[in-house]
């Protein structure tokens, strides 16, 4: 009788994670007597996957009827495959003895596991940045196999080109991770913008995974200030307004200064939102000019999102108004330090 051969017909098998892998093996002879064993890897560190003779292998089942001696099919099925199962599997015939001795091995079947990448996670800079600045976004996805993967960046549907991507590890591994950093130049209109990281992989069947970051969490649009005055009903009263325009985020504190002295401080509350996502706010002061002998320098000082204050001043010419003594008949103090100035916001 011809000497036994161990035939593993498949050089490689590819299986999706979670599925079962069938590894084929047949022998050409019933002799010598002895068990078949399956190993992952070769050499002294090889891992026993299945032993016909003994042991408990809960994930492994034999494909053929193993209770008939004439059965020469020793194919196995391994259930619930994970990337950690990847490797080369050898079907090995042993000769019965003490100890059992390896008689002949198959050529091996390489099992590759197709594992989906995790949902991409996009993270932006720790601190907010202002328009015209360049900020970095990172995108990470893990646990995929095989190694080949495509990553693209978009800003509002427009593909970005300034990015760098690494897939780790460089050598063979059961699964891989991708890390990409994209550079994005901010504009004043980016409050509603999104940065998207898109990952395409063979396991996703043409339906890429996306991770997003809202630039609203990254951008700071500093306000523009405009201080104006217009006369009010009474000749001796002037309404001074501070228009705070196009700022983001909403966190803003405004202080009125009269000749350098704090008159009133308020926090932006009832703001109006612009189409681009920025906010506008207005604060006003009602100034009784008859109470002043000299010109008044009114300053609108704004502290936005914890940044250094910006301010805009307005010189109120007192000489242009007749001074009427005793005309300061304020009935209430609306937060000002002196009874000759009234304020509000809107």
């Amino acid at each position: 009788e011809e000497e036994l051969q161990v035939i593993q017909p498949d050089k490689s098998v590819s299986v999706a994670a979670g599925e079962s892998a069938i590894l084929h093996c047949t022998v050409t002879s019933l002799i010598p007597v002895g068990p078949i064993q399956w190993f992952r890897g070769a050499g002294p560190a090889r891992e026993l996957i299945y032993n016909q003779k003994e042991g408990h292998f809960p994930r492994v089942t034999t494909v053929s009827e193993s209770t008939k001696r004439e059965n020469m099919d020793f194919s196995i099925s391994i259930s619930n495959i994970t990337p950690a199962d990847a490797g080369t599997y050898y079907c090995v015939k042993f000769r019965k003895g003490s100890p059992d001795t390896e008689f002949k091995s198959g050529a091996g079947t390489e099992l590759s596991v197709r594992a989906k990448p995790s949902a991409p996670v996009v993270s932006g800079p720790a601190a907010r940045a202002t328009p015209q600045h360049t900020v970095s976004f990172t995108c990470e996805s893990h646990g995929f196999s095989p190694r080949d993967i495509t990553l693209k960046w978009f800003k509002n549907g427009n593909e970005l080109s300034d990015f760098q991507t690494n897939v780790d590890p460089v050598g063979e591994s059961v699964s891989y991770s991708i890390h990409s950093t994209a550079k994005v130049v901010l504009t004043r209109e980016d409050v509603h913008s999104q940065v998207i990281c898109e990952v395409a992989h063979v396991t996703l069947q043409g339906d890429p995974l996306r991770g997003t970051a809202n630039l609203s969490e990254t951008i700071r649009v500093p306000p523009t200030l405009e201080v104006t005055q217009q006369p009010v009903r009474a000749e001796n009263q002037v309404n001074v307004t501070c228009q705070v325009r196009k700022f983001y985020p909403q966190r803003l504190q405004l202080t009125w200064l009269e000749n350098g002295n704090v008159s009133r401080t308020e926090t932006a509350s009832t703001v109006t939102e612009n189409k681009d996502g920025t906010y506008n706010w207005m604060s006003w002061l009602l100034v009784n000019v008859s109470a002043h002998r000299d010109d008044v320098k009114l300053t609108c000082q704004v502290e936005h999102d914890g940044q250094p204050a910006v301010s805009k001043s307005h010189d109120l010419k007192v000489s242009a108004h007749p001074k009427e003594q005793g005309s300061n008949t304020a009935a209430e103090n609306t937060g000002s330090n002196e009874r000759n100035i009234y304020g509000g916001s809107g």
Epitope: L30, P35, K53, K68
Partner: antibody
């Protein structure tokens, strides 16, 4: 149903011959190592002979040169030709099937009695 | 030839008892050891192979262990039908050899 049925036993004089048969059913005999085991009256079990799937044969020392194991695939049968019989060969002879991969005995026949006496 | 020695040669026990029979090989036989049960006037019945694997249809009250030279057969809770003679056998190499048997009797 997997079954082994022995026949051919009986009374024979010392120096005589006997041929035991074992008819297998429910499996292909040629795919298994097959054995003969005997048990002298009131004694324990003794392995006698085996034939492998390739036709290789094995014997215990006391029967070498006197007994011959064989099989006939067409009849799905196993045989034990016993020559130069001795009184010490008196026993119940069992036909036994070796296991699927390790030759562990799994199926036994009911046995046939061989008595060697003058 | 490999010698197989069983102990004890006979054993008296009661229904419900747990009993252990030992078998020693004169040299390392890996785990190619089988256990058989035989009742008077009947053919032996295969119980265990490769020291600890139960043949199909054998109740789980029978268990085997061991490797190399020392082996045991344990019956966890004796029933009336378990009183019989038990044999061990090495089948690592020819000539296959049996132990002399252990007769399990009702006390």
């Amino acid at each position: 149903e997997v079954q082994l049925v022995e026949s051919g036993g009986g009374l024979v004089q010392p120096g005589g011959s006997l041929r035991l048969s074992c008819a297998a059913s429910g499996f292909t005999l040629s795919s298994y190592d097959m054995h003969w085991v005997r048990q002298a009256p009131g004694k324990g079990l003794e392995w006698v002979s085996a034939i492998g799937t390739a036709g290789d044969t094995y014997y215990t020392g006391s029967v070498k040169g006197r007994f011959t194991i064989s099989r006939e695939n067409a009849k799905n049968s196993l045989y034990l030709q016993m020559n130069s019989l001795r009184a010490s060969d008196t026993a119940v002879y069992y036909c036994v099937r070796g296991g699927v991969w390790d030759d562990a005995f799994d199926i036994w026949g009911q046995g046939t009695m061989v008595t060697v006496s003058s | 030839d490999i010698q197989m020695t069983q102990s004890p040669s006979s054993l008296s026990a009661s229904v419900g008892d747990r009993v252990t029979i030992t078998c020693r090989a004169s040299q390392d036989i890996n785990n190619y050891l089988a256990w058989f049960q035989q009742k008077p006037g009947k053919a032996p019945k295969s119980l265990i192979y490769t020291a600890s694997s139960l043949h199909s249809g054998v109740p789980s009250k029978f268990s085997g262990s061991g490797s190399g030279t020392d082996f045991t057969l344990t019956i966890s809770s004796l029933q009336p039908e378990d009183f019989a003679t038990y044999y061990c056998q090495q089948y690592v190499s020819y000539p296959y050899t049996f132990g002399q048997g252990t007769k399990l009797e009702i006390k």
